[in-house]
């Protein structure tokens, strides 16, 4: 029977700068039961706090709610791991909220194919951010990929779209049938899950574009 | 203990690339940004790029976006810096660091440099 | 880029001695300057970010200040083991900047 080995923090995650959880991984259990406690303290204060809610990130969380949410302040957190044997402490970690979103998927993508009389035929895709970030303040700089394939294919193939929110794509093969979909990212952040894939069917007429 | 170990030095001919590598242990590599650093003899610092493990996302420093690039190989937990088309000023020490935390470009943890020289 | 200018270049101190270190940033940075101290053929050491706050386990006589375009680096009496090079860093902005360095030597 030992104490308890040293556990991580090794993930936080806000999907909208307004609430973040933070996930630990526990060290060794020692053979006996323990228990962890997570305090933090905000950049340039002493006073420690506790996790205010260890229930709605899952096992081995820490939540923080609206009204323990501060933007462009760092905290400083630590997880403490206790059994009879003793504690151990994890690394501390410093945390930006700012820095640590991961969006939903952006919205209402749609896949349209143009053919134009007077220029190559192409494909039209637009999409919407999710409705949890806001743009409008200017705190947010969303970038975005698309990825898509033909439906039997293996590879994705995969466009940066920067910032906006529509994009072309012109070499397609004639007659398949395409799945696309769409992601995005803070700027400093991390991509949200895959869009649902939105399948659009290239009609065979479709000129290759060279 | 977090630890990063670079690979040893290098000697190397103008208008060659070399590959500089980057071993992280004692945390979870995918938490925290990677960022490259280079320092000429006698010089200051200056930052070459930063990737993300978890997802290989990179940003660069325009002087060196054409030449340098950034990768992670996440099953081994090591990042590496290749720079191509080397010229004589391109000798220095360079430095692997860690981001400090889940946040803003400040470096807690470094590597012990590489030196390398580029010489004809 | 962000320009990022530290004076002086060099100081010759001796131990007990407070000295002082400024940087100054050719645009507003905020409070996103870190700053480090590195020995010789040795990696640099975080000492202080956000301008004013201490990383861990760095002692208490180091002290940041400032905000905006100048900051100051303070070490309020030198110890024998402080006598390094010091360069502060912007990160407000892209490329990531450092200072060109102050040699702090004994007198």
């Known amino acids: 029977q030992l104490p308890p080995g040293k556990p991580e923090i090794f993930k936080c995650r806000s999907p909208n700068k307004e609430t973040f959880t933070c996930w630990w991984r526990p060290g060794t259990d020692g053979g006996l039961p323990t228990n962890y406690s997570l305090t933090y303290h905000r950049e340039g204060e002493t006073l420690m706090h506790e996790c205010p809610d260890y229930i709605t990130g899952g096992p081995n969380s820490c939540h923080f709610g609206k009204q323990y949410t501060s933007m462009w302040r760092t905290y400083i957190m630590m997880v403490n791991a206790t059994n009879q044997m003793g504690s151990s402490f994890s690394d501390e970690l410093y945390v930006d909220v700012t820095y640590i979103v991961q969006p939903d998927p952006p919205l209402e993508l749609a896949v349209e194919v143009k053919q134009p009389e007077d220029r190559k035929p192409y494909l039209w895709i637009k999409w919407s951010p999710p409705t949890l970030i806001d743009l409008k303040t200017g705190w947010f700089t969303l970038l975005y990929e698309i990825r898509l394939k033909p439906e039997k294919a293996a590879e994705w193939e995969i466009h940066f779209a920067g910032q906006q929110t529509e994009f072309k794509i012109l070499s397609l093969h004639p007659g398949q049938k395409y799945l696309v979909q769409v992601r995005c990212k803070p700027d400093h952040g991390y991509w949200s899950a895959w869009s649902p894939a939105t399948f659009i069917q290239i009609p065979s007429d479709f000129t290759m574009n060279d | 203990e977090v630890q990063l170990v670079q690979s040893g030095a290098e000697v190397k001919k103008p208008g060659s690339s070399v590959k500089v590598s980057c071993k992280a242990s004692?945390?979870?590599?995918?938490?925290?940004?990677m960022h490259w650093v280079r320092q000429a003899p006698g010089q200051g610092l200056e930052w070459i790029g930063e990737?993300?493990?978890?997802?290989?996302?990179?940003n660069y420093n325009q002087k060196f976006k054409d030449r340098a690039t950034l990768t992670v190989d996440k099953s081994t937990s090591t990042a590496y810096m290749e720079l191509s088309s080397l010229r004589s000023e391109d000798t220095a020490v360079y430095y692997c660091?860690?981001?400090?935390?889940?946040?803003?470009?400040?470096?807690?943890?470094w590597g012990q440099g590489t030196l390398v020289t580029v010489s004809s | 880029d962000i320009q990022m200018t530290q004076s002086p270049s060099s100081v010759s101190a001796s131990v007990g001695d407070r000295v002082t270190i400024t940087c100054k940033a050719s645009?507003?940075?905020?409070?996103?300057v870190a700053w480090y101290q590195q020995k010789p053929g040795k990696a640099p050491k975080l000492l202080i970010y956000?301008?004013?706050n201490r990383y861990t386990g760095v002692p208490s006589r180091f002290s940041g200040s400032g905000s905006g375009t100048d900051f100051t680096l303070t070490i309020s009496s030198l110890q024998p083991e402080d006598f390094a090079t010091y360069y502060c860093?912007?990160?407000?902005?892209?490329?990531?900047?450092f200072g060109g360095g102050t040699k702090v030597e004994i007198k």
């Open positions: 860093q912007q990160y407000s902005s892209y490329p990531w900047t």
């Open positions: 956000s301008a004013s």
């Open positions: 004692g945390y979870t590599f995918t938490t925290y940004w």
């Open positions: 660091a860690r981001n400090g935390g889940l946040g803003p470009a400040w470096f807690s943890y």
């Open positions: 645009q507003y940075v905020g409070t996103a």
């Open positions: 990737i993300d493990p978890s997802d290989s996302y990179s």
